[in-house]
């Protein structure tokens, strides 16, 4: 079944209560426009945003009988001429008579007649109509023949994109058959289709078809009011392509539309071949879109590649939500033209600062005021990380201008980074030289403390991403952040007592649920000693507050529980509810405190792994005093397992110094290999392996710098830690660097026991962990490990 037939069938279903063969039509209030009712229009009770009234009429081909319900009688079948009267196209019937077409359509043959309704003739330009009436034997006859096809074609035969030769000079009739059931012929809508005649079929259409001999190019070249668009099309080498065969839709901006553009914008675009071509192509669709087919908002891909939304409001057509079409359906031999009074500018032709919407005006205004806009050169590439207007508090806006400028610089990147280019663990550099971390979650992408909202766009010289909050790059480590805040003094002292201070100091990616001093309310010094006395217990408790990976509260899908595996090994449950983070159903007091090696979420209760039993009465008493949200299991004599810390400590490479250093003058032409041992570098990134996101952590024991050497190679070792002694050693081995890699796998960031895999590489004095494989691999020099 064709779309037309499907909609007709729906109308028939909606009308069956009224009797047999009754169809429900919807008429737009205040107009004479009627449509067979589609499912969507029926439930909306509107077409083109305008209310409709439901009319019940006989379905095509049926008629009423006096005293009977519905339309039980079938319409009589007659020749095409007689059928014109049956469907009420009496003006077309009259013109067919006076033009001597009558005998043709009463006689032998098979015809399809697209007959204009009486109203269509009334709406025809009076001069054109008078011209036809004054020359009935030639002009009128030709005009009517141009509405006819030499064979019977029902709506099911009228396929989208078809061009049928008419009976006048074989001039083409452009058929469009849209999914909403609308069928058009040269953009005239079939309002009553498939009226079978003995020698053909009649389709009533809503306008008189005018002769088409010109292409879109011809029309542009002849129309003075489109001279700006024509000139721009010439500049962009597009005018000729609009003369070729095709089914185009052109939204042609008038000269007045170009006048509305700020002159600077036009001058910039017209001076940029890429932008001007994008601008022109954004006005062209590769499909023919008649105005009559638009009964609601729909998105169409333009020749430029981006989409435009075409909608309607009553009789007006809107593009991207703005009423701008002032002349519709200029049909040409290769498409249709709609004249518009605004120039459509695609994102790809906009400067990055122009991509910002109404919700980012505070950001863009500040960028301009503080002189940062001028640094966004048209031929450069940038990324704006634009916070929404309400992210800027009054306090922020009243800051010293220099501070404010520094804050804004954190929101502009030196390179163009599209949404699809972002990945977990990525480091982005701002124009102020700050480094920002990217965190990718199931339903969110965050940069430092701030997560994105919809609306990323790519422009001519950059991209823009929209953020909920002002981005605040971290300055301090987890340990330093805890140390500077008195609320965490007890937790910090326990951390140090458990020998875990280093863990929060070194580089890495952690999420710490930091209990405030309130979590230890009522704990006596004796009880504290008891806790410190069992190092394994203390480590288990503290490490249950620490999770590998950075989990920002705002990055969680609201209302959904996220199960994470802690460093201690047990699971922790996180959920975002009404802007609050719940940790094991306990409300976090403050979340998303960013640090250089992770994030802190503040809790005012001590957390405890529900699956770990306690075997000591005194410890149980203490824990029950501090932890109320769960029932801690007691299993007499059970002890806390030792947690192998090697997994979380950086692996250090040992270098054997053999003999005394050999000092000698290096002659010209000889070069030196210099190996600089720095802090272990920890890099994390997510790779998709066999369709599963796998988080890869690379811990590198040193960076190396190689200055090519033909013969002699030397190693310089900086021992760090305040020592300044240097030892030179002749390089006796090829193996320069060993890299320790941990691969932590799983679905996104939710680590299950069986999913955790760790690869230990190199000679580290580690306790062998039963579940893990230990592999000695070849030396690998990674890109990250090479400093230039």
């Amino acid at each position: 079944n064709s779309y037309y037939d499907k909609v007709l069938a729906h109308s028939r279903i909606r009308g069956r209560d009224q009797g047999p063969n009754v169809c429900a039509l919807q008429q737009i209030l205040g107009t004479k426009k009627k449509y067979f009712s589609s499912c969507k229009n029926w439930y909306q009770g509107a077409i083109c945003g305008k209310k409709t009234t439901v009319l019940y009429e006989c379905c095509p081909g049926y008629m009423r009988m006096e005293g009977m319900k519905g339309c039980p009688a079938v319409m009589p079948i007659d020749h095409v001429y007689g059928t014109l009267g049956i469907v009420g196209a009496t003006t077309t019937q009259h013109y067919s008579d006076v033009s001597k077409l009558r005998e043709e359509i009463e006689g032998k043959g098979s015809y399809t007649y697209f007959a204009p309704s009486n109203e269509a003739w009334e709406n025809l330009d009076s001069d054109i109509r008078r011209g036809l009436e004054n020359n009935v034997n030639v002009e009128l006859l030709n005009a009517l023949h141009s509405h006819m096809v030499n064979k019977r074609m029902l709506t099911k035969d009228l396929k989208h994109g078809m061009v049928i030769p008419s009976m006048y000079n074989n001039l083409g009739l452009f058929i469009n058959h849209y999914p909403n059931g609308v069928v058009t012929v040269n953009c005239a809508r079939v309002i009553h289709g498939n009226q079978i005649a003995t020698n053909g079929v009649v389709h009533v259409i809503d306008r008189v078809l005018t002769q088409i001999g010109t292409s879109i190019q011809d029309f542009l070249e002849a129309e003075d009011d489109l001279s700006s668009f024509r000139a721009a099309a010439i500049t962009s080498d597009l005018l000729e392509s609009l003369g070729r065969d095709g089914h185009f839709t052109l939204f042609a901006p008038t000269n007045e539309a170009f006048e509305k553009l700020p002159r600077g914008v036009l001058e910039r675009i017209m001076g940029d071949k890429v932008a001007s071509e994008a601008l022109m192509k954004y006005h062209i669709l590769n499909t023919l879109q008649c105005s009559e087919a638009i009964t609601g908002g729909a998105v169409f891909e333009t020749m430029e590649g981006n989409t435009i939304e075409i909608g309607c409001e009553g009789d007006s057509i809107s593009i991207n939500g703005i009423k701008m079409v002032n002349k519709k359906d200029i049909v040409t031999k290769n498409g249709v033209i709609h004249l518009i009074d605004e120039v459509l500018i695609p994102d790809s032709a906009k400067q990055v600062i122009e991509l910002a919407g109404k919700q980012q005006t505070t950001f863009t205004d500040l960028v301009a005021q503080l002189g940062l806009a001028s640094s966004l050169k048209p031929d450069g590439e940038y990324t704006l990380l634009a916070p929404v207007n309400n992210a800027f508090s009054d306090d922020t806006l009243s800051m010293d201008q220099r501070l404010l400028k520094l804050i804004l610089q954190n929101h502009i990147l030196k390179v163009k980074v599209g949404l699809s280019d972002l990945y977990n663990g990525q480091i982005l550099e701002t124009i102020g030289g700050k480094q920002l971390r990217v965190f990718v979650y199931r339903t969110a992408i965050c940069i430092e403390n701030s997560c994105m909202v919809r609306g990323s766009k790519q422009g001519r010289n950059g991209a823009i991403h929209i953020f909920r909050e002002i981005i605040q790059p971290a300055e301090k480590s987890l340990h330093d952040k805890l140390r500077q805040d008195k609320r965490f003094s007890i937790f910090l002292s326990l951390l140090e007592a458990a020998d875990l201070k280093d863990l929060l100091t070194q580089p890495g990616d952690w999420t710490l649920f930091a209990p405030t001093n309130d979590a230890f309310k009522g704990m006596t010094s004796e009880e504290r000693e008891l806790l410190i006395g069992d190092k394994n217990a203390l480590q288990n408790i503290i490490l249950y507050h620490l999770t590998p990976g950075v989990y920002i509260g705002k990055g969680f899908e609201p209302g959904v529980t996220n199960i994470l595996k802690t460093t201690q090994g047990s699971k922790i449950y996180l959920k975002g509810v009404n802007e609050t983070l719940l940790v094991n159903e306990l409300k976090s007091k403050e979340s998303d405190i960013m640090t250089t090696n992770g994030v802190i979420h503040v809790v005012d209760k001590l957390l405890y792994p529900a699956d770990i039993p306690v075997g000591n009465d005194q410890l149980l008493e203490l824990l029950n005093k501090l932890i109320k949200y769960i029932q801690i299991k007691f299993v007499r004599g059970s002890t806390f397992k030792e947690i192998p810390m090697t997994v979380y400590r950086p692996a250090m490479t040992k270098i054997q110094i053999e003999g005394d250093p050999d000092f000698r003058l290096i002659k010209e032409g000889e070069t030196v290999t210099e190996v600089i041992h720095g802090e272990p570098v920890i890099k994390k990134y997510t790779k998709i392996i066999d369709g599963v996101p796998v988080e890869i952590t690379e811990k590198q024991t040193r960076e190396e710098r190689i200055i090519t050497g033909p013969e002699i190679k030397y190693t310089r070792i900086s021992t760090g830690g305040g020592e300044t002694g240097e030892t030179l050693q002749k390089f006796l081995q090829k193996e320069v660097s060993k890299v320790t890699k941990f691969i932590e796998g799983g679905d996104g960031h939710l680590f299950e026991d069986e999913e955790i895999k760790r690869l230990l590489q190199g000679d580290t004095p580690a306790k062998k962990i039963p579940a893990n494989k230990r592999v000695q691999g070849p030396r690998r020099r990674s890109r990250e490990g090479r400093s230039q």
Partner: antibody, heavy 118, light 110 residues
Framework: QVQLVQSGAEVKKPGASVKVSCKAS????????ISWVRQAPGQGLEWMGW????????NYAQKLQGRVTMTTDTSTSTAYMELRSLRSDDTAVYYC???????????WGQGTLVTVSS | QSVLTQSSSASGTPGQTVTVSCSGS????????VNWYQQLPGTAPKLLIY???QRPSGVPDRFSGSKSGTSASLAISGLQSADEADYYC???????????FGSGTKVTVL
């Protein structure tokens, strides 16, 4: 063919005003804008501003803001430029040019010499 | 004082190629297109090149324009005596919100 015909030369005293006309023919007047450009004797060109013949919208050069007014009469396809509070450094040949924006100043009038002298 | 800088004169013999340069800044040529006008002695200017390199109909292909960064140039090949004129470059200036012209280059055919 496109033609822009300007009014004749004018001699004005400092402080006075001058109004130069520019009659267009050979194209649809309201489909294009008109820009005004002046050229002091032996000097380069200076853009004064633009007017839309369709809407009457104007865009004046900052330097002349407050002293210049551009208007159009669509019934006669004529553009006007009035300059007030004339000074001796306003002595120049004043040109009107059809301004399509996409193709700027594609046709020019023959120029009108305005001399400001006491 | 013109915003765009042009060399005051250039010359060549018939048949030669002469290049006229025009230098600006990031707010004019750097951001926007360049147009070129020819003014024959005692006449009104005439549009020669628009949008950096586009020739209006009727302008011979001996005239060509180009732009790079904050400068632009006009090349006249196969120089003819009829080409003796002043040549002006022009661009929109974003910071002044004004259309600015160069100081003009007098081309002489030797």
């Amino acid at each position: 063919q496109v033609q822009l015909v300007q009014s004749g030369a004018e001699v004005k005293k400092p402080g006075a005003s001058v109004k130069v006309s520019c009659k267009a023919s050979g194209y649809t007047f309201t489909s294009y804008g008109i820009s005004w450009v002046r050229q002091a004797p032996g000097q380069g060109l200076e853009w004064m501003g633009w007017i839309s013949a369709y809407s009457g919208n104007t865009n004046y050069a900052q330097k002349l803001q407050g002293r210049v007014t551009m208007t159009t009469d669509t019934s006669t396809s004529t553009a006007y430029m009035e300059l007030r509070s004339l000074r001796s450094d306003d002595t120049a040949v004043y040109y009107c040019a059809r301004d399509m924006l996409v193709v700027p100043f594609d046709y020019w009038g023959q120029g009108t010499l305005v001399t400001v002298s006491s | 004082q013109s915003v765009l800088t042009q060399s005051s004169s250039a010359s060549g013999t018939p048949g030669q190629t002469v290049t006229v340069s025009c230098s600006g800044s990031s707010s004019d040529i750097g951001s926007n297109r360049v147009n070129w006008y020819q003014q024959l002695p005692g006449t009104a200017p005439k549009l020669l090149i628009y949008s950096n390199d586009q020739r209006p109909s009727g302008v011979p292909d001996r005239f060509s324009g180009s732009k790079s960064g904050t400068s632009a140039s006009l090349a006249i090949s196969g120089l003819q005596s009829a080409d003796e004129a002043d040549y002006y470059c022009a661009a929109w200036d974003d910071s002044l919100s004004t259309y600015v012209f160069g100081s003009g280059t007098k081309v002489t055919v030797l």
